[in-house]
């Protein structure tokens, strides 16, 4: 660490005083202070002189020495007053710069310990300082002000209290900065934008920060637009609109539009797409087929997107039968805005019923005329199964009926003993019908098919099983030949 | 050399609309937005609103909307305003103003005026 | 709106002398001040943009000054042609506004 001779922390001289300062290290050394007038630097090898023949207010202020081989970057400091009475302060810097939160250092030294006790911190003008300034007073380096906030970017003078009279340095100006986090805020109203040709229409882009110094503009494709900025300060943020008023809109306005703002920390952009048609329109579409087929007792959702500008005047659900009158009831509807020109409706049909089953309509309404988009649901039954014994052109004939949706397949089955249904073990012999003829086949009803297994004789000690399946389920039907006549078993439900 | 010339002078009755112009030339038209400035009776200045001739974008003060409609013809490069329900307070002169520093920014003082048209409202 | 005030509406100068319009806006305006000369019977004539920027033509006797709320116009060695009334604008924000006027008027 280098000496400073003389090896006083403080030095304390009058003006016009000779002041040697000398500072000897290992290796070689370096003087740094305030920049003052008079001084002499003599350097020789280890060791640097500073001097003056004629000290001055201004030379007052901290000598440090460093040795810039040093690695351990060890220093040796002293402070000088040199005491006029005339001048009580030496003023380093006239304009200090902090941003908000920061210390302050109003860099006015007392060129006279002794007067410490009186000094104080004053505005220009003897005005008072703000209310919650917090400050503190070191002789040797100046007022700090304490978490310095942007309102206080003011001027400042330094008071010193001399033979009863209050003394004022020069003028040092504080500009506290306001702490930019990042680009300004950006707001750009409407997120879309629809137009019919000749209609009006109008784009907000907004920018705020806490800072004024910053630019924004409203860029068509890539026309940055001359629009008359509105400026405004609240909540503690500077806020710039421009606002785009187009009377009557063309096709040249349709096209991307990006609000942009930048400032030091950056540029931040947001976009919208605006649109100019023709004429109104209003187009309806699903995400789902439009033949729906879903099993009894289940539930289901139908859902219509629609895109339309102008907005709706009208929309509403209808069945359309072909059971009964019933409509849907309201409370069943619901409708979801996606954005302004797009909306979805969803009709929801909880527990389907028999009844249920048929055409569903969505229609809406707006300057454009009238939508309709129908869907049509059928709904799917598990096999229901009925046999009877009868003679078909004088052949005995077991004939099996099957009813459900989607059109059930038939097989029959033949197993020895008398049972409910024929399991594996019993079964004696299958025939499957590829083509059983249809008895109807009405759109939304079930499907009815009919198969005939001619039987030359019923063997009493065994079964016949009709079992229909589809895709929802499967029956069956048992018959079992009794000498007094046949008996049927339907299943067990 | 940049010239705006306005139309001449206008009596009308109260209740009435006038519709004056603004002829550009010596620069192009489209390339600088329009302002309308109101002065009354040798008072102050006012400013009514502007167009952007390429573009068709409006902004007028509050006070004057409802009361003043910017257009423009870019084919005779042709500034308009048109005022309505005229009413003394409507007596004036008003200018036609060019926006100086034409580059997109957000400069907006006015460089080149036309030389004003009287409207005078008198029953 | 921003209200931009001109305290003086008539000033009495010298000619050759030096005179000093001020003009404070209502709120701060960043420096986006105009400076207007109107003679009687013509169209306003922008003397300075920007607070302190001389327009192309406009004698160096003009200067503008100011920042925040407060802006000055000055003009030095006062020719007879200066003897007329001198306007503010304030272009920071819609609505667009303008000071009352200032008129010189020789002593």
């Known amino acids: 660490i280098p000496v400073i001779e003389p090896s006083v922390p403080e030095l304390v001289v009058k003006p016009g005083a000779t002041v040697t300062l000398r500072c000897v290290g290992n290796g070689s050394v370096e003087w740094d202070g305030p920049p003052s007038p008079h001084w002499t630097l003599y350097s020789d090898g280890s060791s640097s002189i500073l001097s003056t023949n004629n000290a001055t207010f201004q030379n007052t202020g901290t000598y440090r020495c460093t040795e810039p081989g040093d690695p351990l970057g060890g220093s040796a400091a002293i402070h000088l007053y040199v005491k006029d009475p005339a001048r009580p302060w030496n003023v380093l810097a006239q304009e200090v710069v902090v941003f908000e939160d920061q210390d302050a250092l109003l860099p006015c030294l007392l060129t006279d310990p002794v007067l410490e006790a009186g000094v104080s911190l004053v505005r220009v003008r003897g005005r008072p300082l703000m209310r919650h300034t917090n400050y503190s007073f070191s002789p040797g380096h100046g007022f700090t002000i304490h978490r310095a906030k942007f309102i206080q970017s003011q001027d400042y003078q330094c008071s010193a209290l001399m033979g009863g009279r209050k003394v004022m340095s020069i003028s040092i100006r504080l500009k506290v900065q306001k702490v930019i986090p990042g680009p300004p805020a950006l707001t750009l109203v409407p997120a879309e934008l629809v137009r019919i040709r000749g209609e009006a229409a109008q784009i907000v882009c907004s920018a705020s920060s806490v800072d004024v110094n910053f630019d924004v503009f409203l860029q068509h494709n890539n026309t940055k637009l001359a629009i008359p900025q509105q400026s405004d300060f609240h909540n503690n943020r500077y806020q710039k609109v421009l606002t785009l008023n187009l009377d009557q809109v063309d096709f040249q306005h349709a096209g991307n539009y990006s609000c942009v703002a930048s400032n030091v920390q950056g540029k931040h952009s947001t976009s919208m797409f605006f649109r100019v048609v023709e004429s109104a329109y209003l187009n309806l579409s699903s995400e789902q087929n439009l033949i729906q087929e879903v099993t009894v007792g289940e539930g289901l959702n139908l859902k219509v997107m629609v895109e339309a500008y102008p907005g709706l005047q009208g929309f509403n659900w209808t069945y359309l039968g072909p059971f009964s009158d019933h409509q849907p009831e309201p409370k069943l509807a619901n409708a979801t805005t996606k954005d302004t020109y797009r909306h979805t409706f969803t009709l929801s049909l909880p527990r389907l019923k028999p009844s249920e089953a048929g055409r569903y309509s969505f229609l809406a309404r707006n300057p454009g005329g009238w939508r309709a988009l129908t869907f049509e649901l059928t709904l799917r039954y598990p096999p229901e199964v009925s046999v009877i014994w009868t003679f078909i052109n004088g052949s005995g004939t077991l004939l099996c009926a099957a009813s459900g949706y989607p059109q059930p397949n038939v097989t029959w089955l033949q197993c020895s003993g008398h049972t409910d249904r024929c399991d594996e073990a019993q079964v004696l012999q299958v025939w499957d019908d590829p083509y059983p003829e249809v008895l109807s086949q009405e759109p939304f009803h079930k499907v009815t098919v009919q198969s005939l297994l001619t039987v030359e004789t019923l063997e009493h000690n065994q079964t016949y099983e009709c079992r229909a399946h589809n895709s929802v389920g499967s029956g069956s039907w048992a018959f079992i030949p009794i000498s007094a006549g046949a008996h049927t078993h339907p299943p067990d439900e | 050399e940049v010239q705006l010339q306005q139309s001449g002078p206008e009596l009308e009755k109260p209740g009435a609309s006038v519709k004056i112009s603004c002829k550009a030339s010596?620069?192009?038209?489209?390339?600088?937005?329009m302002n309308w400035v109101k002065q009354s009776n040798g008072k102050s200045l006012e400013w009514i609103g502007n167009?952007?001739?390429?573009?068709?974008?409006?902004t007028y003060n509050q006070k004057f909307k409802g009361k003043a409609t910017l257009t423009v013809d870019k084919s005779s490069s042709t500034a308009y305003m048109q005022l309505k329900s005229l009413t003394s307070e409507d007596s004036a002169v008003y200018y036609c103003?060019?926006?100086?520093?034409?580059?997109?920014?957000?400069?907006?003082?006015?460089?080149?005026w036309g030389a004003g048209t009287t409207v005078t409202v008198s029953s | 709106d921003i209200q931009m005030t001109q305290s003086s509406s008539y000033l009495s100068v010298s000619l050759g002398g030096r005179v000093t319009i001020t003009c404070k806006a209502s709120?701060?305006?960043?420096?986006?001040l105009a400076w207007y000369q109107q003679k009687p019977g013509n169209a306003p004539r922008l003397l300075i943009s920007?607070?302190?920027s001389l327009e192309t033509g406009v004698p160096s006797r003009f200067s503008g000054s100011g920042s925040g709320k407060d802006y000055t116009l000055s003009i030095t060695s006062l020719q007879t042609e200066d003897v007329v009334t001198y306007y503010c604008?304030?272009?920071?924000?819609?609505?667009?506004?303008f000071g009352s006027g200032t008129k010189l008027e020789i002593k």
């Open positions: 103003a060019r926006r100086g520093d034409y580059s997109g920014s957000s400069y907006w003082y006015f460089d080149v």
């Open positions: 010596g620069y192009s038209f489209t390339g600088y937005n």
């Open positions: 167009i952007d001739p390429y573009y068709g974008g409006t």
């Open positions: 709120d701060h305006i960043n420096n986006w």
């Open positions: 920007g607070a302190t």
């Open positions: 604008q304030q272009y920071w924000s819609t609505p667009f506004t």
